[in-house]
Interface confidence: medium
């Protein structure tokens, strides 16, 4: 079953707020004047990076010799973070005495550029898209999936990890942004807000949706994640708005009804498996790229976002699921589990289609600001 | 360095419940997965089942009728309660300390710490 | 429950010998094994977690590699120690289970 559509020939954010054009380049602030991120109504808004020590590149990563076995990405900095995660922060837990097993925790200090350097880092997600900056770039081609239509079994981990939901994929599911441009999906998880308050982590012309999608790929050029950390392209993640709609979603419902199973922190059960790519919207043609990180500790850049023009609609019920079910650290509830959005810092977002021209009477001549950085690709 | 040790009586009566608990001691039970695992005299291994340390646990299918895993924090500890033992329940019990990775993506790290194992008889 | 099987399920060998065992998941379980070694009255050793990597203070000379269904332990040169059971373990699905053991004795 193909996933209902947004409308198809408005770029994100006329589709959503139920208008028919998007916004006109008069409308939006400059970069520069623009808040670094704009919050829904109602919460607060979080204390900026700017003053924190900017750091262009992730350190190499390199894997532990031999003898030590492989880097784990847990291999972090020892840090203690009451607080309350109710509200989103760029905050991280680390519990003290939990070797190699970290915990992330959205609220509380200290700031994440302490647990992980890279979390100040200058390419940061998420990040605000704004259409009508966007580059058109037409080398940008449709996404290519391949394997993603799992049969029943093996069975997939759908695991509460204190900080999402996260499906662990089986080897086999290969994505492609382009020509020589391979991956292999690792594992999906999303982000979500609380009764009323949307989570999504990026944010169009400021608006923050209901939720988001993330599914994250490997490269192949890379045997291991502690690899492709911090390395430009080595890791790329899929990511797709979820939206209230009339109907329920049935690929998402394979998911959503399991998780009372897995409302613990920690907890984990067995799904069958199920077709991947009815999670995302059907249109693979239309999207926004840049680079980025990711959006957790270690906040390793280099990371190759891909956001899908068109959102996914879920049920207001399946929504009310997502956000009401799960439990986080310290007997909280696992809500509004998103990072603010993070300053550009000059960073061009692309797009597969032309985004920044408005179809509205008003509008002389196509809008766009900024040229395609990726033509020759 | 954390060391597990496991305590519990070594003779069980058959159709009684037998109870071992897991000492942790050298680090902190939280934010990992803490096994049991059975190896009957001259066998394999048998993995009972596990707990993390908010309290969820999964079990043994084939166990999971008479199994119970509980943890106390506040204590560094975690027991096993095994009902209605039989012959067939006797053998060496360990408690290990099993990472599965709760980052950003799936990893398994094994069973990287385990406990000496203590000997349990079912015998009337 | 997927079965682990392993092979061959004992063998002899000599010091400085190179041994390989192999173990085979009865469905795929993409890199999430592990192998343990075990010496009589003794609790299991991790030497291997994540099929290939190397379990800390673990030497050298043991080795895994494989994916998906078929995996193989490696001793490049047996030492004296080395003469145990040993164990995969698979921890794709639930309930994690082992194989039956491999052992390497003397000949």
């Known amino acids: 079953q193909r996933l209902p559509r947004m409308q198809e020939d408005s770029p994100l954010g006329g589709g959503s707020s139920g208008e028919d054009d998007p916004l006109g380049e008069e409308d939006l602030p400059s970069e520069e004047d623009s808040p670094r991120e704009e919050d829904p109504p109602g919460e607060e808004d979080l204390p900026g990076e700017e003053d924190l020590p900017g750091e262009e590149d992730l350190p190499e990563v390199k894997p532990k010799s031999e003898e030590e076995g492989s880097l784990k990405l847990e291999d972090l900095p020892t840090v203690e973070a009451p607080g309350d995660p109710q509200e989103p922060q760029n905050n991280a837990h680390r519990d003290k005495e939990g070797d190699d097993q970290s915990h992330w925790r959205y609220g509380g200090d200290p700031p994440w550029p302490r647990v992980s350097p890279a979390c100040a880092g200058r390419f940061q997600s998420p990040v605000d898209i704004r259409p009508q900056l966007a580059a058109f770039c037409p080398a940008l081609r449709p996404l290519e999936l391949l394997g993603f239509q799992l049969p029943p079994l093996p069975e997939l981990r759908l695991r509460n990890n204190g900080h999402s939901v996260q499906l662990t994929l089986p080897p086999g599911l290969e994505m492609a942004l382009g020509p020589g441009r391979e991956y292999r999906a690792l594992q999906l998880h999303l982000h979500w807000g609380a009764a009323g308050r949307p989570g999504s982590e990026h944010t169009v012309e400021g608006h923050r949706f209901p939720a988001e999608i993330h599914v994250v790929h490997l490269s192949t050029a890379f045997a291991r994640v502690d690899e492709a950390l911090g390395r430009p392209g080595g890791l790329a993640v899929l990511a797709a708005f979820l939206e209230e709609g009339p109907e329920e979603n049935s690929a998402y419902e394979q998911l959503l009804s399991r998780l009372e199973e897995i409302a613990e922190e920690g907890s984990e059960t067995q799904v069958p498996g199920l077709d991947i790519s009815a999670l995302l919207p059907s249109d693979f043609s239309r999207y926004f790229q840049y680079e980025g990180s990711l959006t957790t500790p270690p906040c390793a850049q280099g990371v190759i976002w891909t956001v899908f023009n068109q959102t996914v609609m879920l049920s207001a019920k399946q929504l009310h699921t997502l956000s009401d079910t799960l439990w986080g650290p310290g007997d909280s509830r696992l809500q509004l589990n998103f990072r603010a959005t993070q300053p550009l810092n000059g960073r061009v977002i692309e797009a597969s289609f032309p985004a920044g021209v408005d179809s509205s009477p008003r509008a002389a001549e196509p809008v766009q600001l900024n040229s395609c950085l990726a033509a020759g690709d | 360095q954390v060391q597990l040790q496991e305590s519990g009586p070594g003779l069980v009566k058959p159709s009684e419940t037998l109870s071992l608990t897991c000492t942790v001691s050298?680090?902190?039970?939280?934010?990992?997965?803490w096994s049991w695992i059975r190896q009957p005299p001259g066998k394999g291994l048998e993995w009972i089942g596990y707990i993390y340390s908010s309290g969820s646990t999964n079990y043994n299918p084939s166990l999971k009728s008479r199994v119970t895993i509980s943890v106390d924090t506040s204590k560094n500890q975690f027991s096993l309660k095994l009902s209605s033992v039989t012959a067939a329940d006797t053998a060496v019990y360990y408690c290990?300390?099993?990472?599965?990775?709760?980052?950003?993506?799936?990893?398994?790290?094994?069973?990287?710490?385990w406990g000496q194992g203590t000997t349990v008889t079912v015998s009337s | 429950d997927i079965q682990m099987t392993q092979s061959p399920s004992s063998v002899s060998a000599s010091v400085g010998d190179r041994v390989t065992i192999t173990c085979r998941a009865s469905?795929?379980?993409?890199?999430?094994l592990a192998w343990y070694q075990q010496k009589p009255g003794k609790a299991p050793k991790l030497l291997i977690y994540?099929?290939?990597s190397l379990q800390s203070g673990v030497p050298s000379r043991f080795s895994g590699s494989g994916s998906g269904t078929d995996f193989t332990l490696t001793i490049s040169s047996l030492q004296p120690e080395d003469f145990a059971t040993y164990y995969c373990?698979?921890?794709?699905?639930?309930?994690?289970?082992f194989g039956p053991g491999t052992k390497v004795d003397i000949k």
């Open positions: 994540a099929a290939s």
């Open positions: 050298g680090g902190s039970i939280s934010s990992y997965y």
């Open positions: 290990a300390r099993d990472q599965h990775s709760s980052s950003f993506y799936y990893y398994y790290y094994g069973m990287d710490v």
């Open positions: 469905q795929g379980i993409s890199s999430w």
């Open positions: 373990q698979q921890a794709n699905s639930f309930p994690l289970t």
